[in-house]
Interface confidence: medium
Amino acid sequence: MQLSQVSDLLTQEQANLTHQKKKLEGQISARQQAEEASQESENELKEMIETLARKLNEKSKEQMELHHQNLNLQETLKRVANCSAPCPQDWIWHGENCYLFSSGSFNWEKSQEKCLSLDAKLLKINSTADLDFIQQAISYSSFPFWMGLSRRNPSYPWLWEDGSPLMPHLFRVRGAVSQTYPSGTCAYIQRGAVYAENCILAAFSICQKKANLRAQ
């Protein structure tokens, strides 16, 4: 074998080895990438599992809370079942009182009779909270509502049905305050303000009675 042939063989072998080396390097790189990808997806899976576990934990907490709420509601319902309703049907309950907004238009005396027949009196406003509630309740109505406030003539004080005087800080009576009417002057509430008017005129009315707040 000649020296030139050996040289050729070595060159060929070197080329082969270089090719093999590159091939191996490519395989190693591919494997590394695959391992990295595998690591990444493993991390993602771990994160997913952690998130699901966290959510599951939250849901079970929520479920526990709902369960407690349910128990509380059942307790409340048991208590309510042992109580009678604070107000009769169609009456509105607010604070210590029940209110009924009349479905007919009558003069003050007739309105008073209607309330009495329902074991109630015409509206009496005792506090600013009462006034706020009534104002809110009638804010969408165009109609005047008789209340249980009247006076014989302008020289007399405004009195509620039970004989107690109107507290001046609650509201000011507007309108025909200086007029004298044979049937007396009565007060009505409309759109949140209180007005004096001839008791003989027809208007809606508001009846009021104590709410039943005693547990049986």
Partner: antibody, heavy 115, light 107 residues
Framework: QVQLVQSGAEVKKPGASVKVSCKAS????????VHWVRQAPGQGLEWMGA????????AYVQKFQGRVTMTRDTSTSTAYMELSSLRSDDTAVYYC????????WGQGTLVTVSS | DIQMTQSPSSVSASVGDRVTITCRAS??????LVWYQQKPGKAPKLLIY???SLQSGVPSRFSGSGSGADYTLTISSLQPEDFATYYC?????????FGQGTKLEIK
């Protein structure tokens, strides 16, 4: 959609009565007041009164007291306004309107009072 | 009864103008005030209620303001369809009274 449809034009003699109808649709008739407003030719708007269809209770302007009657028929969701003892100055277009305030109006009914 | 006085009774303006109409009540009405627009041969249309609340579907160029006994309707930039008669109405206490109207005409 909410609609108020009024009856057609009327020609009446002085002293007679007229009854205008207002048929409501598209909402719960008993939940909203129906108001009546009139407008004489070339003049402004004049509020006449209102009825609460749920209860039938009504409120009228003093000027029309004794001459006007507002009624309703809940079975047909119709409100009525009757004006009696008609005079020539009652010639006007009469409108009904749903209140909250008056967000929907009828098309108007022209009532002409002439001898 | 509460008297409502509108001013001016008529106003001439051009498209794009800003127009202000005022309404004065004979007593404080606590913002219980509405504004209507009426075109010839048509029923009035509600624009503003409770003094400053814009009725749904009404363009935002219309605005209402005021308190006590004095109220204002403003049209920020007049459009051709805005030429009409405008009315205020108090609804504090019956009888609900209207202003006499303001006619808005093209200059």
């Amino acid at each position: 959609q909410v609609q108020l449809v009024q009856s057609g034009a009327e020609v009446k003699k002085p002293g007679a009565s007229v009854k205008v109808s207002c048929k409501a649709s598209g909402y719960t008739f008993t939940d909203y007041e129906v108001h009546w407003v009139r407008q004489a030719p070339g003049q402004g708007l004049e509020w006449m009164g209102a009825i609460h269809p749920g209860s039938g209770g009504a409120a009228y302007v003093q000027k029309f007291q004794g001459r006007v009657t507002m009624t309703r028929d809940t079975s047909t969701s119709t409100a009525y306004m009757e004006l009696s003892s008609l005079r020539s100055d009652d010639t006007a277009v009469y409108y009904c309107a749903r209140w909250l305030p008056m967000d929907y109006w009828g098309q108007g009914t022209l009532v002409t009072v002439s001898s | 009864d509460i008297q409502m006085t509108q001013s001016p009774s008529s106003v001439s303006a051009s498209v794009g103008d800003r127009v202000t109409i005022t309404c004065r009540a004979s007593q404080g009405i606590n913002n219980w005030l509405v504004w209507y627009q009426q075109k010839p041969g048509k029923a009035p249309k509600l624009l503003i209620y409770a003094a400053s609340s814009l009725q749904s579907g009404v363009p935002s160029r219309f605005s209402g303001s005021g308190s006590g006994a004095d109220y204002t309707l403003t049209i920020s930039s007049l459009q051709p369809e805005d030429f009409a008669t405008y009315y205020c109405q108090q609804y504090l206490i019956t009888p609900y009274t209207f202003g006499q109207g303001t006619k808005l005409e093209i200059k």
